[in-house]
Interface confidence: low
């Protein structure tokens, strides 16, 4: 028998064989095409399921087809997830989680934003009261407190008196930015603590002067008697 | 088809360890967040734990925090999680889950965890 | 922690009803990452509802998700007998991921 394929018959990229019963050519196609001599393009956009995954758009070529990918996807059949991640969108040691076509980002406690890119503002609240000023930090605020007050927003008045301060039975009066001590008779100075100099100015006449609480007392000097030794 | 098989589950005792494995099938896993979820007898769903598609990024339930570590090998496309000081209150159904909103979940594992 | 409460504990109602179901926020959920979820006895949950309102493949248009900030909604125009089961709301915005504690959709 003649070899059939001496003719090229077959489409320049299939496989030429002999049928040797009949002498006829057997074309072997590439994929793509069709056909007796395999010159005909077999149309994959049309044949049974869309080759493309994720419902990619199919194109279809001589002898292939392409895949126009929706977003997010990719391949040459869409096959492939984008990781929209890759490029690090999110800010602030935020976790980033991919997703079809976009990414979400998970933002650490005290951030807020599609990328975790705002540092919420703890102090917009005003949570610092009686005075104390706000400074905002990351998830918090911190409230530096006036003279007198304490507690995380400041809210505690002190009560200086605590500490008892005040000397010699003196009575403590809390004061918003400190305290008063109420000094008992014979005492005076800020914390009481000082005995007020009955002896000032001398009150003995012919004597010693001998201070006291409140009191005074005079020694008087050989011959002089009396209380001021008058 | 997409799927997520949990092994090593079991009986453990108090202060013991267990570590639960996924295997992912059907997506493209090294893409994906990966979560553990669990259910405790009669209960409700409660989130464990999250890791990112690379593994860099981790987080943990306050409730397992330094005691339970999630971790993933993307070339064999497993997600593990390793369990230490176990706690009665730790029994439950363990699913792992892809992404954060779970669109694929297992089919669970169960932990118990009891003398 | 964003706390999601959810409302009723369980809603008795019969087949070919209308179901309404509540997922509140203590706060504002951002980008209303919100998802529901359906569980059958013995099985795991699926996902129902993403990004508040879409639905996810797979899930019969009869479920419909709504809401935005703090306060959502998972709908059910009319109930199939394979819809009585129990349904969880959960929040992707922050960690920790937190979920609601479930609806019980049972048989009147």
């Known amino acids: 028998l003649d070899d059939a394929c001496v003719s090229n018959p077959c489409h320049e990229d299939a496989i030429c064989d002999t049928n040797p019963v009949s002498g006829r050519a057997i074309c072997t196609c590439p994929p793509g095409f069709t056909g007796g001599a395999c010159d005909q393009d077999v149309d994959e956009c049309s044949i049974g399921a869309n080759p493309c995954e994720h419902l990619g758009r199919c194109v279809n070529t001589q002898g292939s087809f392409l895949c126009q990918c929706g977003r997010g996807y990719t391949g040459p059949r869409c096959e492939t997830d984008v990781n929209e991640c890759l490029s690090g969108p999110c800010r602030n040691q935020a976790t980033c989680l991919d997703r079809i076509g976009q990414f979400t980002c998970i933002c650490m406690a005290g951030f807020t934003g599609t990328y975790c890119e705002v540092d919420i503002d703890e102090c917009q609240s005003s949570p610092c009261v009686n005075g104390g000023v706000c400074k905002d930090r990351v998830n918090g605020f911190s409230c530096t407190c006036p003279s007198g007050f304490s507690g995380s927003m400041c809210q505690l008045d002190v009560d200086e008196c605590a500490s008892t301060p005040c000397r010699n039975g003196a009575k403590c009066v809390d004061q918003p930015d400190g305290y008063e001590c109420r000094c008992a008779e014979g005492f005076e100075g800020t914390l009481c603590e000082r005995n007020v100099d009955d002896c000032s100015p001398d009150p003995c006449h012919h004597g010693r002067c001998v201070d006291g609480i409140a009191s005074f007392s005079c020694a008087c000097a050989p011959g002089y008697t009396g209380i001021r030794c008058e | 088809e997409v799927q997520l098989v949990e092994s090593g589950g079991g009986l453990v005792q108090p202060g013991g360890s267990l570590r639960l494995s996924c295997a992912a099938s059907?997506?493209?896993?090294?893409?994906?967040?990966m979560s553990w979820v669990r259910q405790a007898p009669g209960k409700g769903l409660e989130w464990v734990s999250v890791?990112?598609?690379?593994?860099?990024?981790?987080y943990y339930a306050d409730s397992v925090k330094g005691r339970f570590t999630i971790s993933r090998d993307n070339s064999k496309n497993t997600l593990y999680l390793q369990m230490n000081s176990l706690r009665a209150e730790d029994t439950a159904v363990y699913y792992c889950a892809r992404s954060i909103f779970y669109t694929t979940w297992g089919q669970g594992t169960l932990v118990t965890v009891s003398s | 922690d964003i706390v999601l409460t959810q409302s009723p504990a369980t809603l008795s109602l019969s087949p070919g009803e209308r179901a309404t179901l509540s997922c509140r926020a203590s706060q504002s959920v951002r980008s209303n990452y919100l998802a529901w979820y359906q569980q059958k006895p013995g099985q795991a949950p699926r996902l129902l509802i993403y990004g508040a309102s879409s639905r996810a493949t797979g899930v019969p248009a009869r479920f419909s998700g709504s809401g935005s900030g703090t306060d959502f909604t998972l709908t059910i125009s009319s109930l199939e007998p394979e819809d009585f089961a129990v349904y969880y709301c959960q929040q992707y915005s922050n960690f920790p991921i937190t979920f609601g504690q479930g609806t019980k959709v049972e048989i009147k």
């Open positions: 059907g997506f493209t896993f090294s893409s994906s967040g």
């Open positions: 890791i990112a598609s690379s593994g860099s990024n981790t």
